[in-house]
């Protein structure tokens, strides 16, 4: 999906209002220095591309993020403010259904969410630079 035509201001508002709080809740008990951020993003479409991939693509070490509250809200936000996004997400929905139901938060999932927080913060910063 090409995120170029999204309403970035609206996505930022949704992130600051709800998604960020859910991410921080997920990370509760860990310090921001506990994990080393190894990925970043260049501009707004790039940030959303990587956020989408990291949130919804299961990895061998962390298969369950797609079922988390922040992931559901991320999906709803992208569907709302990115034209045509919903139609491209049928496969992603299947992946969410296949994701493990276990609510155990592994260290690797915490690391992945730490990376997500970094990508979202970069998204906000690139938005501020453009204004």
């Amino acid at each position: 999906y090409d995120f170029t035509n999204c309403d970035f201001q609206k996505i930022e508002a949704d992130y600051l209002r709800t998604i960020s709080k859910d991410l921080i809740t997920y990370m509760s008990g860990t310090k921001s220095t506990d994990f080393n951020n190894t990925v970043s993003c260049s501009n707004r479409p790039h940030c959303l591309t990587e956020i989408q991939s990291l949130t919804f693509n299961p990895t061998p070490r962390c298969a369950s993020l797609a079922k988390e509250m922040f992931a559901r809200k991320t999906k709803a936000t992208l569907a709302l403010w990115c034209p045509g996004y919903s139609e491209t997400q049928i496969n992603a929905t299947q992946a969410m259904k296949k994701a493990r139901k276990s609510k155990v938060t592994t260290n690797k999932c915490l690391e992945q969410v730490s990376q997500l927080l970094g990508l979202w913060r970069r998204f906000i910063r690139t938005l501020l630079k453009k204004q």
Epitope: N36, N37, T38, V39, S40, C41, S42, N43, P45, H46, T49, E50, S53, L54, N57, T59, P60, R61, Q112, Q115, K129
Partner: antibody, heavy 117, light 108 residues
């Protein structure tokens, strides 16, 4: 300390597919970062080809996108480049590199690929 | 596509002298710029990222400055091992990351 090593044929015929592999040691490619390909024609500058991130997202240089495929084999800690329909203009030293999806902090030593019949 | 123009193409200096290399972008890249050093037969090495942050293990004599369209790499006092080709790279314009054409720093 991460080390990267390119391997593959040094000579490819025009119109064929160039295939290279990068073997990574000292770091798991499924643990973090992105894993990129960059090339440098003899005596010229650098050109970014694309990357695959540790979680599987892929991004390509638009000028090469129609001909490029980057994939990975996490069990071997390798990632690969395929470039189809090559011409003499694709003759270059090909580098694999580790990236944070922005810039490139560790590089392989490079492998020269010549396109010639 | 953002074009990066490096100047001069060649810089002839003696060890101990100060080297000032320029990189100009065709449009603003904010501070999304990196510098690399490449010696003959070797891979490039990251020196500077985010326009002014030194990469791990890079000596303090290397410094970067600038923002927007004009950037400078300064080598305060050239060591014999610093004679090489230097490239700038912008990462503001995903998915079109581009490099400059390079500046060669040679011994006078």
């Amino acid at each position: 300390q991460v080390q990267l090593q390119e391997s593959g044929p040094g000579l490819v015929k025009p119109s064929e597919t160039l295939s290279l592999t990068c073997t990574v040691s000292g770091y798991s490619i499924s643990s973090g970062y992105g894993w990129s390909w960059i090339r440098q024609p003899p005596g010229k500058g650098l050109e970014w080809i694309g990357y695959i991130s540790y979680y599987g997202s892929i991004s390509y240089n638009p000028s090469l996108k129609s001909r490029v495929t980057i994939s990975r084999d996490t069990s071997k800690n390798q990632f690969s480049l395929k470039l189809s329909s090559v011409t003499a203009a694709d003759t270059a030293v090909y580098y694999c590199a580790r990236t944070n999806l922005l810039y490139f902090d560790s590089w392989g030593q490079g492998t020269l690929v010549t396109v010639s019949s | 596509e953002i074009v990066l123009t490096q100047s001069p193409a060649t810089l002839s200096l003696s060890p101990g002298e100060r080297a000032t290399l320029s990189c100009r972008a065709s449009q603003s890249v904010s501070n999304n710029l990196a510098w690399y050093q490449q010696k003959p037969g070797q891979a490039p090495r990251l020196l500077i990222y985010d326009a002014s942050s030194r990469a791990t293990g890079i000596p303090a004599r290397f410094s970067g400055s600038g923002s927007g369209t004009d950037f400078t790499l300064t080598i305060s006092s050239l060591e014999p091992e610093d004679f090489a080709v230097y490239y700038c790279q912008q990462y503001s314009d995903w998915p079109q990351y581009t490099f400059g054409q390079g500046t060669k720093v040679e011994i006078k």
